[in-house]
């Protein structure tokens, strides 16, 4: 007979996992806010900037109360994957004017990637059903001009900021229900 079975492996406290996810999200939120401000200083541009390929904002702050944990995490993960893809596209196709923000965009991409891994871990810790693999997304067309790249960057950072703000509020609210 083999060695006696060890003590059952205790899953880490999901509240602690959620805490570290909140911290990561909040840090990314502040850095995104700052990077967007930096971009606006470098390239002043009036008005709101939109990009049709970006996800629509998941939820208004007022509707947070009705949220359930699986739905929040699944939707947040899907939206952040889209933003990760857009940041990668921006770094690749954004044009020479955005090269000055390359270190910051690279850091942003790495942190987004880290947050997505953290969400994945949280979902498995909570024994939530894993979402199916993402279908391949259609490629994003390169910006039509240097100014188009800047406007796209402003739209991506603005949308990511709103999504992360929503995420922090949602995660903190859900923590109270665990």
């Amino acid at each position: 007979p083999g060695p006696p079975p060890g003590p059952p492996r205790v899953s880490p406290d999901p509240r602690a996992e959620l805490d570290s996810t909140v911290l990561l999200t909040r840090s990314l939120l502040a850095d995104t806010r700052q990077l967007a401000a930096q971009l606006r200083d470098k390239f002043p541009a009036d008005g709101d900037h939109n990009l049709d390929s970006l996800p629509t904002l998941a939820m208004s702050a007022g509707a947070l109360g009705a949220l359930q944990l699986p739905g929040v995490l699944t939707r947040l993960r899907a939206d952040l994957l889209s933003y990760l893809r857009h940041v990668q596209w921006l770094r690749r196709a954004g044009g020479s004017s955005l090269k000055t923000l390359e270190p910051e965009l690279g850091t942003l991409q790495a942190r987004l990637d880290r947050l997505l891994r953290r969400l994945q871990l949280l979902m498995s810790r909570l024994a939530l059903p894993q979402p199916p693999p993402d279908p391949p997304a259609p490629p994003l067309a390169p910006p039509s001009s240097a100014w188009g790249g800047i406007r796209a960057a402003l739209a991506i950072l603005g949308g990511l900021h709103l999504t992360l703000d929503w995420a922090v509020r949602g995660l903190l609210l859900l923590k109270t229900r665990l």
Epitope: L23, R26, S27, A30, A36, A37, R40, D41
Partner: antibody
Framework: EVQLVESGGGLVQPGGSLRLSCAAS????????MHWVRQAPGKGLEWVAY????????YYADTVKGRFTISRDNAKNSLYLQMNSLRAEDTAVYYC?????????????WGQGTLVTVSS | EIVLTQSPATLSLSPGERATLSCSVS???????LHWYQQKPGQAPRLLIY???NLASGIPARFSGSGSGTDFTLTISSLEPEDFAVYYC?????????FGQGTKLEIK
Amino acid sequence: EVQLVESGGGLVQPGGSLRLSCAASGFTFSSFGMHWVRQAPGKGLEWVAYITPGSNTIYYADTVKGRFTISRDNAKNSLYLQMNSLRAEDTAVYYCAREYYSYDEGFAYWGQGTLVTVSS
Amino acid sequence: EIVLTQSPATLSLSPGERATLSCSVSSLIPSKYLHWYQQKPGQAPRLLIYRTSNLASGIPARFSGSGSGTDFTLTISSLEPEDFAVYYCQQGVDVPFTFGQGTKLEIK
């Protein structure tokens, strides 16, 4: 040596206006975000407003939103706070402050402050 | 808005003693966004510690900071007469940026 010198404070009636200035020297003013922070007599510190180096992003505390306007003139190394519709509760010493080297490192340099008194 | 609550409101100690000041944050914040300031009567505040544990320029090594999440601490290992002042914590992760109400460190 970094220096920040506020001016423009004084006595003003409720509903009145005042414009504070902050003259900066000893650093590249156009490279740093700047803040206004105030302190009512005998009370704690209250953040008022922030402006990025290029003036394209501005944040305000809810207590002053719509009444105060922060601005800067990088050519003159100056920061401003235009205060309108002043209330008794705006009475405070107003400090201008510079962020450290990065936005997330706190308010590293402060002026000596200028006193604003709102009273009839 | 993120609320910072400092305790105790007043701390009475003697020179040479160790001082421990607390700052409790209403919501989880990353430690790199928590800073400490010292203010003496009639003077502007002075940055002591930034990003929870980094000493600002010119600050003596008897000052140290620690903490994470919602609980942060400023420690003065051995009080000097010039350390008696008001101390404020501040968060910079969320707009509006907010300060604690202050802890007054007075001579016993």
